[in-house]
Each structure stands twice: as C-alpha cells, then as structure tokens.
C-alpha cells in the first residue's frame, strides 16, 4: 500500500482558556527526513489553513512566531496545540501531513478533529 494514512481524534473539547490539543499520527510509507504538518479548518465546504510547520525527523516542530499553534514531534506522531480559540472557532480541524524530502513526496490527510469551544461565562459582580 503506497498511500499514507493519518489518524487523529474525532472530537476534542477546548479548555476554558481556549486551548485545544490533539495527536496527529501518520503511517509513513517512505523514509522521510523532512516532514510538513498543516492544520486546516473546514467550515461548510471552505478549507482554510490555520498553521503549518516543517520539521526534520528527530527535531522539534517549529511554527512561526505569530502562529496560534505549537507542537512537539515524536517519531511518526505530532502533538498539536491550538491556542486563542473562541466559540466561533468551533469546527473541524484537519491534520495534513506531507513527506517532503527525500522524494517521492507523500500526502496524508486525516478525517478531522471536531473541536468544540465554549466561551467562559463572565464572572458575576461581587459586593465584596
């Protein structure tokens, strides 16, 4: 089988601080040294890129400084964390893995993780 399989959890609930974490695991059909991981958000039929990082196998995952994502890698497993989420960001977050180097290139796309975000209730005013 030449196709790459990507697994991710079906559902994740974000914390009250708007942080959601999930694991993205891929079964590599090749011996890649450079891997690109992208988080996509699917709303209706529109797909947008949330964040992306390229890493060398054995090294840490590095997202851009202004990215809302952070992550760590261990073998064929990536632990992804998305921060700053609000209730309006609830949706399907898809993990996309690309084996970039050496050739051949491989693409793997997960089925998506439905992330539910609930905005915290504002604290009631206190007389004390």
């Amino acid at each position: 089988c030449k196709a790459m399989h990507v697994a991710q959890p079906a559902v994740v609930l974000a914390s009250s601080r708007g942080i959601a974490s999930f694991v993205c695991e891929y079964a590599s059909p090749g011996k890649a040294t450079e891997v690109r991981v992208t988080v996509l958000r699917q709303a209706d039929s529109q797909v947008t890129e949330v964040c992306a990082a390229t890493y060398m196998m054995g090294n840490e995952l590095t997202f851009l400084d202004d990215s809302i994502c952070t992550g760590t890698s261990s073998g064929n497993q990536v632990n992804l964390t998305i921060q700053g989420l609000r209730a309006m960001d609830t949706g399907l977050y898809i993990c996309k893995v690309e084996l970039m180097y050496p050739p051949p290139y491989y693409l793997g796309i997960g089925n998506g993780t439905q992330i539910y975000v609930i905005d915290p209730e504002p604290c009631p005013d206190s007389d004390f």
Epitope: A3, T38, L40, E49, Y106, L107
Partner: antibody, heavy 118, light 107 residues
Framework: EVQLLESGGGLVQPGGSLRLSCAAS????????MSWVRQAPGKGLVWVSS????????YYADSVKGRFTISRDNAKNSLYLQMNSLRAEDTAVYYC???????????WGQGTMVTVSS | EIVLTQSPGTLSLSPGERATLSCRAS??????LGWYQQKPGQAPRLLIY???TRATGIPDRFSGSGSGTDFTLTITRLEPEDFAVYYC?????????FGQGTKVEIK
C-alpha cells in the same frame, strides 16, 4: 477573481530553450504550492513539475529532469518554467495549476502552446 | 509510479441519461483521487477531490465514490454542457499521475 495566466509559449527549434511564466491573482500566491502540467495535441494530461510555497521543495517528472527548471517569485505572484534542450516530444499546451490545500490541482490557467519543430 | 486506467475510453449517451465512468489505480491511492472535466480548447476543471467531495460550484448531479484502487464518477442526468473529456488523477504521492481520459459524447 482567482486567476492564473500563462505566457511565453511559441515555436522553438529542437535543442532550443523557452521560459514560460504564470501570473497569479485573486489569492495569496505565497501560501500555495504550484505545478506545471502539459498536454500534447490530442493526448491526455501529464504532470511536469511542482514547487512548494516557499520554493524549498521541487519535484520533476523523469521525462524533464535535468532539462526543465521550475521556480517562483512570491513578491511578483509569478511561477516560471525554464525549458532547455527541448525535444519534439515536449510539444504541448503547458498549464500552470494551483495545488489546493486538500491536494488536487484546484485552479488552472488557460494554457500556453509550446511547439518544438525544425 | 501509480498507473491510472480509465474505462470506457468513450461513452456515447443522450442528454438526460446517466453516465458512469471508472478509474482503476495500479496500487492503493486511499482516497487521494480527483476528477477533472475538460472541454475542447479549455483548461481542465476540478470536479471532485478526496474521491467523493465536490469542488466549489460543482452541481450535485456529479458524484464520486470509491477508495483504494477502484473509483467511479457518476453524472446522474447528463446536461448538454457535460459532454466533454473526464480525467482522474491521484495526488497521494509523486509523480502525480492522470488517467488517459474518458470522452463522454452525444449519441
């Protein structure tokens, strides 16, 4: 409107060179990988080359490896294909295509014709 | 490389009829398969990706199915503008490859 517009095609002698360009508009060009696909007269579609969004990764079909060079200029929203040592079998319409976020070629240009003949 | 074989080569049908096009891969491509429509003198247009997801703006008479090595594109009721050549493509690994095409012509 999302659009790709190729240019640079024409008639060239065997062994000659040609540089194709593809101007992108209506989307964030620097966020997408891009590809070239060709189609010989009356034949099917054949992938030629692809380049990642930042130009870090480049892939070629075996039939053009060592002769063709793909490149891009994100500041100019442009994709290029430098074709050297051209052969008669390179005669085709050359399309530039955007590689969609989910993998397929989701936006195509109208194509530019390259004819290699003496 | 992964070879995609489309069948039939030509499909002769009348408007309003159902068209069923097949694409078979030489090895598994999972669901990393797209379908394109091309009319004479025009660029290809993406119809289906992920084997079964319609691209933006594609009418629901077009549907895709399959996974692994066997895929099908179905056009439920052919409209005059649907007569064209259809290509399948795998994008799960390089080199990216296309089928040889199926021509849907008016009977």
């Amino acid at each position: 409107e999302v659009q790709l517009l190729e240019s640079g095609g024409g008639l060239v002698q065997p062994g000659g060179s040609l540089r194709l360009s593809c101007a992108a508009s209506g989307f964030t060009f620097s966020s997408y990988a891009m590809s070239w696909v060709r189609q010989a007269p009356g034949k099917g579609l054949v992938w030629v080359s692809s380049i990642s969004s930042s130009s870090s990764y480049i892939y070629y079909a075996d039939s053009v490896k060592g002769r063709f060079t793909i490149s891009r200029d994100n500041a100019k929203n442009s994709l290029y294909l430098q074709m050297n040592s051209l052969r008669a079998e390179d005669t085709a319409v050359y399309y530039c295509a955007r590689v969609g976020l989910m993998g397929p070629f989701d936006i195509w240009g109208q194509g530019t014709m390259v004819t290699v003949s003496s | 490389e992964i070879v995609l074989t489309q069948s039939p080569g030509t499909l002769s049908l009348s408007p309003g009829e159902r068209a069923t096009l097949s694409c078979r891969a030489s090895q598994s491509v999972s669901r990393y398969l797209g379908w394109y429509q091309q009319k004479p003198g025009q660029a290809p247009r993406l119809l289906i990706y992920g084997a079964s997801t319609r691209a933006t703006g594609i009418p629901d008479r077009f549907s895709g199915s399959g996974s692994g090595t066997d895929f099908t594109l179905t056009i439920t009721r052919l409209e005059p503008e649907d007569f064209a050549v259809y290509y399948c493509q795998q994008y799960g690994s390089s080199p990216w490859t296309f089928g040889q095409g199926t021509k849907v012509e008016i009977k």
